[in-house]
């Protein structure tokens, strides 16, 4: 089982849409795949895929999940808020027929505030 996640870095404006993609590949067929998205280490959702369908369509606040055969799991955040900024990781595990798991690399999401003055204040608050 292998998981490739993208993009590595995503910068979007508050109120717009962010799309995170996870490609899950397995050399042999699987009956049930457990998937998980985390943000800053906290679980956003942990549905499974069987018979070509996701058991859950929502994933965290304003998050929509979709599965596109053969291998693409997409997390769409819409509308994006400042709270969505963080480090996202996609994880997958084949539960049937045999347990095998893998996770992607981090996608770092940066959300720019709609108000440019907020943006200036935020940049000014960085140390150094």
């Amino acid at each position: 089982l292998s998981v490739q996640q993208g993009p590595n870095l995503l910068q979007v404006r508050q109120g717009s849409q962010a799309t995170l993609v996870c490609q899950v590949d397995q050399a042999t067929a699987w009956e049930r795949l457990r998937v998980k998205w985390t943000k800053d280490g906290a679980i956003l959702c942990q549905p499974y895929i069987t018979n070509g369908s996701l058991s859950l369509g929502v994933c965290g606040p304003q998050g929509r999940l979709s599965w596109q055969a053969p291998s693409h799991l997409t997390l769409q955040l819409d509308p994006v808020s400042l709270n969505h900024s963080g480090a996202y990781v996609c994880w997958a595990a084949v539960e049937i027929p045999e347990l095998e798991e893998a996770e992607g690399n981090i996608t770092r999401l940066f959300v720019d505030p709609d108000d440019p003055t907020q943006n200036r204040n935020r940049i000014a608050s960085f140390p150094g």
């Epitope: 590949d25 067929a29 070509g52 291998s71």
Partner: antibody, heavy 120, light 113 residues
Framework: QVQLQESGPGLVKPAQTLSLTCTVS??????????WSWIRQFPGKRLEWMGY???????SYNPSLKSRVTISRDTSKNQFSLKLTSVTAADTATYCC????????????WGQGTMVTVSS | DIVMTQSPDSLAVSLGERATINCKSS????????????LNWYQQKPGQSPKLLIY???TRLSGVPDRFSGSGSGTDFTLTISSLQAEDVADYYC?????????FGDGTKLEIK
Amino acid sequence: QVQLQESGPGLVKPAQTLSLTCTVSGFSISTSGYYWSWIRQFPGKRLEWMGYINYGGGTSYNPSLKSRVTISRDTSKNQFSLKLTSVTAADTATYCCATMADRFAFFDVWGQGTMVTVSS
Amino acid sequence: DIVMTQSPDSLAVSLGERATINCKSSQSLFSSNTNRNYLNWYQQKPGQSPKLLIYHASTRLSGVPDRFSGSGSGTDFTLTISSLQAEDVADYYCQHHYETPLTFGDGTKLEIK
């Protein structure tokens, strides 16, 4: 460019252990998503998958070989090996190593194969 | 184990004519999760290792001539060579990767008539 090369004795006595090594060049056997297999072809041309070791060191074997088979690896030498115990004349075959990936699940690179005869 | 049954065992076709090789699996190789058939076709010429032609039942590997095509789904699959060339003389094998153990068909020997 990935290349695989089998090595080992061409003659093994019945009841002994057949040991072969596959040396991989141009690619790391620890690369995520890749599987390293042993396949044999009998004199009558029939192909049999014996088992694989994956990028994390996990293994899967053909149940028909009844625990006679072990596949291991040496990442420092970028090699993986086959051991087949209690051989008989029926194990006489050409032994090939091959690789496949999760994303494209086919044997895309094969070694040239090495003929092993089991005979006293 | 999934049993792969190939037919015919051998086939003689005139140059320029169509060659058809069949492969039947003892259980379905189609997954609704991935919308894929877990079946590959290989060509093996004398003294060489097998070479992949077709994967996922119908996807031709880059560099393989377009006279080779794969079709079928579930349990019944076909490899077709639309216009046989002299260099196509070889043994052809189907192989599933639906589950372990991975198994091969017994092969079809293709010759020129």
